[in-house]
Interface confidence: low
């Protein structure tokens, strides 16, 4: 008799793929644009990335450090009108892209939460949640919650409002903290909260260190759904050298949870390569004319246009990984098992019931080395075969689809491999 199929878990929309943050509309659109109407014209691009949600803004009225002149119910006219926002929501829905609104109150000021008037601000947030839920948004983000006194209780209250409206609505909280205990204390009282933090921001050193960070986090959070990013708002290049960007894309897309990216992560956008551009929100490089005032600063391979035409580019890798992440059961909600491998390596398996299984091997080091996979670490339900098919490598030159002997697997410096193999009873 065939073994019984495992019952599928309940899947919310944010479980099915990546979220894409656009914190600065003007920098994202460039060319003197930067409003909601212009963003609507970029939704096809977001669709091509196969992302499931757009984390937008903040876009509300906020006069720096002035509570009275901060209105979470009003869109700053520089970004457009309520009608523009409604139109964006409708277009996004047609393309199956959910819209999450950032309501961090004092986003233009020194303290995001007006430290002296916490209760006033909390009331404003509550009113705003109800208003924007009625308007049709799919969720909310609040950042810098380490600056919010009694954050846990406020988040619990805001979560109740959000979930009370619909279980299909999401609340994201962001913190600059990288301390696991602080992160856990925020998560403790808030079931279903998606938390972005700087937890992984110092993970770039070695595979062993990354493995221990990831496994500690997953063990500590139990069976709750996680999100994966390197910070609550910043670009990957704020933390990583260029040679690790592909490796991290592969990792973020294949860990159990929701990967969260900032605009530009898909092309390796880096402020230091763009004279005069701010670290937190450099102008998005759509093509070579996106940064017109400094001739020669931008080459084609730094842009969306250039990378779209190159199957070996970071953007092409992002699109492929995003596509795999959104359609393979083992990557959508499969079990995760990390296991030992050679020095500088992080390797793990993702599997769900009788579906196709995935092996990820990441070489964080700058030397090529044999994988030396220790399958003895794995439970019987997740055993490794002798061979697995290469789905993709982060480096050019390997023949995709070819079976690789796991015993003899060797990785190039900074190479990541995604391999697939069938379930075997």
């Amino acid at each position: 008799r065939a073994p019984r199929c495992r019952e599928l878990p309940a899947q919310k929309w944010w479980h099915t793929g990546a979220l894409y943050r656009i914190g600065d509309l003007q920098a994202f659109q460039g060319h003197g644009a930067g409003n909601l109407a212009g963003l609507k014209g970029r939704l096809d691009y977001l669709s091509s990335l196969k992302v499931k949600g757009l984390v937008l803004g903040p876009i509300h009225k906020n006069q720096k450090d002035d509570v009275a002149q901060t209105d979470l119910l009003q869109i700053d006219p520089n970004f457009g009108s309520k009608e523009d926002f409604d139109s964006l929501l409708q277009s996004a829905k047609k393309k199956s892209i959910r819209v999450i609104l950032d309501l961090t109150p004092n986003y233009r000021g020194e303290n995001s939460w007006f430290s002296t008037q916490v209760d006033t601000v909390a009331t404003k947030v509550k009113d705003a949640l109800e208003f924007w839920l009625q308007a049709g948004v799919d969720g909310f983000q609040v950042r810098d919650i380490e600056n919010l006194k009694d954050a846990s209780s406020f988040l619990a209250e805001w979560q109740n409002i959000t979930k009370g409206f619909s279980e299909d609505r999401l609340l994201i909280a962001g913190t600059n903290s990288s301390d696991l205990q602080q992160i856990l204390s925020l998560l403790e009282s808030n079931k279903d909260l998606l938390l972005t933090s700087s937890y992984l921001s110092d993970s770039g050193s070695t595979g062993e260190h990354t493995k221990s960070l990831v496994t500690q986090y997953l063990n500590a959070t139990g069976n709750r759904w996680c999100s994966w990013s390197l910070s609550q708002a910043r670009l990957l290049t704020s933390f990583l050298p260029a040679q690790l960007l592909r490796l991290y894309q592969l990792m973020l897309f294949t860990l159990p949870g929701t990967p969260v990216f900032s605009y530009g992560d898909e092309i390796g956008l880096d402020a230091a390569a763009l004279p005069g551009q701010p670290m937190e929100a450099p102008v998005m490089l759509w093509d070579e004319s996106s940064f017109p005032d400094i001739p020669g600063a931008v080459s084609a391979n730094m842009t969306v246009k250039g990378q779209s035409e190159d199957p070996g580019s970071l953007l092409s890798l992002f699109r492929r990984l995003s596509d795999q992440r959104s359609k393979e059961r083992s990557l959508l909600h499969g079990d995760f098992h990390a296991f030992s491998a050679g020095p500088g390596l992080f390797s793990y398996i993702r599997h769900w019931d009788q579906n196709e299984r995935f092996l990820v091997v990441l070489n964080f080091g700058d030397v090529g080395l044999s994988a030396g996979l220790q399958a003895s670490d794995l439970p019987a339900s997740a055993s490794l075969p002798a061979k697995a098919d290469l789905l993709l490598s982060t480096q050019p030159g390997r023949e995709e689809g070819s079976p690789l002997e796991l015993e003899r697997l060797k990785l190039e410096p900074h190479e990541g491999l995604l391999l697939r193999f069938p379930y075997a009873a």
Epitope: N176, P241, G276, M279, E280, A297
Partner: antibody, heavy 116, light 113 residues
Framework: QVQLVQSGAEVKKPGSSVKVSCKAS????????IEWVRQAPGQGLEWMGV????????NYNEKFKGKATITADKSTSTAYMELSSLRSEDTAVYYC?????????WGQGTLVTVSS | DIVMTQSPDSLAVSLGERATINCKSS????????????LAWYQQKPGQPPKLLIY???TRDSGVPDRFSGSGSGTDFTLTISSLQAEDVAVYYC?????????FGGGTKVEIK
């Protein structure tokens, strides 16, 4: 808020090298670009180069290419600038600065004296 | 490279009087896509590192007294000290942060008359 503390004054012989350090504390090291600026005695300010400590990407003033090498170590939140083939005209105070674009935070400066 | 020219080289002003320093760029510092001027002003006292006063040509850094103000757009910029105090004696520099290499003006020394 970020505090930048630089290494102490150095006296060097012509032709030698010197490595000046700049240790950041306070805010996250990777939140800032680290810039290096020099000021010769009685002179104005001259921008030398910049590093993004997160990605390691650098940009140099043409004038200092081959003369200065800027690096950063995220694990110790420290940026470095090494000057090679020192000459008497390299005698100056060297400042590191934490910036987004403008130079918001400055180290106290390191005086490098090149003298035979 | 873009050249930043400051004038005058030095300036002697009575306490309580207005001091005005000019800075001219050989190329526009106004960036079309965000309509911001990529210019900053610094104050440097003897034996100290420079201190940021103004960025985006007219935004005062936190903690900077409101007697300091910046104005101008494109290629011509001004730093004004509306009522000179004894502690304002220093050298003032403008700096462009638009396109590498960043460049500074030659500096203006402000003294008390």
């Amino acid at each position: 808020q970020v505090q930048l503390v630089q290494s102490g004054a150095e006296v060097k012989k012509p032709g030698s090298s010197v490595k000046v350090s700049c240790k950041a504390s306070g805010n996250a090291f990777t939140n800032y670009l680290i810039e290096w600026v020099r000021q010769a005695p009685g002179q104005g300010l001259e921008w030398m180069g910049v590093i993004n400590p997160g990605s390691g990407i650098t940009n140099y003033n043409e004038k200092f290419k081959g003369k200065a090498t800027i690096t950063a170590d995220k694990s110790t939140s420290t940026a470095y600038m090494e000057l090679s083939s020192l000459r008497s005209e390299d005698t100056a105070v060297y400042y590191c600065s934490g910036s987004a674009n403008w130079f918001a935070y400055w180290g106290q400066g390191t005086l490098v004296t090149v003298s035979s | 490279d873009i050249v930043m020219t400051q004038s005058p080289d030095s300036l002697a002003v009575s306490l309580g009087e207005r001091a005005t320093i000019n800075c001219k760029s050989s190329q526009s510092l106004l960036y079309s896509s965000n309509q911001k001027n990529y210019l900053a002003w610094y104050q440097q006292k003897p034996g100290q590192p420079p201190k940021l006063l103004i960025y985006w040509a007219s935004t005062r850094d936190s903690g900077v007294p409101d007697r300091f103000s910046g104005s101008g757009s494109g290629t011509d910029f001004t730093l004004t000290i509306s009522s000179l105090q004894a502690e304002d004696v220093a050298v003032y520099y403008c700096q462009r942060y638009y396109g590498y290499p960043w460049t500074f003006g030659g500096g203006t020394k402000v003294e008390i008359k």
